[in-house]
């Protein structure tokens, strides 16, 4: 069964700067990745970035840099200033559209006891089957 993992990290150098890493554990070919915050995309969440492996990347503030790390994982750096900056309990979600598995989404947030610059190891978050 495919799984999605989400890792959220607060940068030690900029306490309001976050790095989100997401990965897809499955055998299918990924056709689109959507990163959102405030909840799952389409369920109250706000899209931060969309990554298409053959067309490119689209991001919206406060996203600073979205990128593919591997064929099945992505990372997103968020700016840490302004009214739209994230806070420690913000939920981030990643949705992977894959063929033939369909769409899989998982969410995560900064571990409550995390020190800046540290994060929990990437583990599969609760999986939501989108379709």
């Amino acid at each position: 069964t495919p799984e999605v993992w989400v890792q959220v990290r607060m940068e030690a150098t900029e306490l309001s700067s976050f790095t989100i890493r997401c990965g897809f554990l499955g055998s299918g070919s990924i056709s689109l990745v959507t990163v959102s915050w405030g909840g799952p995309n389409g369920a109250g969440g706000t899209t931060l970035a969309v990554l298409h492996p053959e067309r490119g990347i689209r991001q919206w503030a406060p996203a600073r840099q979205a990128r593919w790390e591997t064929q099945s994982s992505i990372s997103l750096i968020l700016e840490g200033s302004g009214a739209s900056s994230p806070c420690a309990n913000t939920t981030f979600c990643c949705k992977f559209a894959s063929f033939p598995e369909g769409s899989w989404e998982a969410c995560g947030s900064l571990p409550p006891s995390s020190d800046p610059g540290l994060s929990a190891p990437p583990t599969p978050a609760p999986i939501l089957r989108a379709d």
Partner: nanobody
Amino acid sequence: EVQLVESGGGLVQPGGSLRLSCAASETYFDLYVMGWYRQAPGKDRELVATITYTGSIKYVDSVKGRFTISRDNAKNSLYLQMNSLRAEDTAVYYCNADPSGLGRKVYWGQGTMVTVSS
């Protein structure tokens, strides 16, 4: 499919300048890496310069200080300002785009000829 169309090539004297442009058909997504490559007659295609959508730039040593790569993300357009041109810069210059930065799918333009000769 992303289409890339180059323009700006031509004949120029040694020491002269040219500005190449590359327009991409993709208008919604930013192409992660865009770059210029060139192929001189009888030689292999070689990298000239690349730029990511966040502005990270790389140049081949032979053009450093003479060529400047830039891009307009809003238009997904790529540029190459070529100054102090030399005869050895004569080549067909190709625009390249790697939307993911992983090489999963790479697109090429048709090329534009740059001839440096007196």
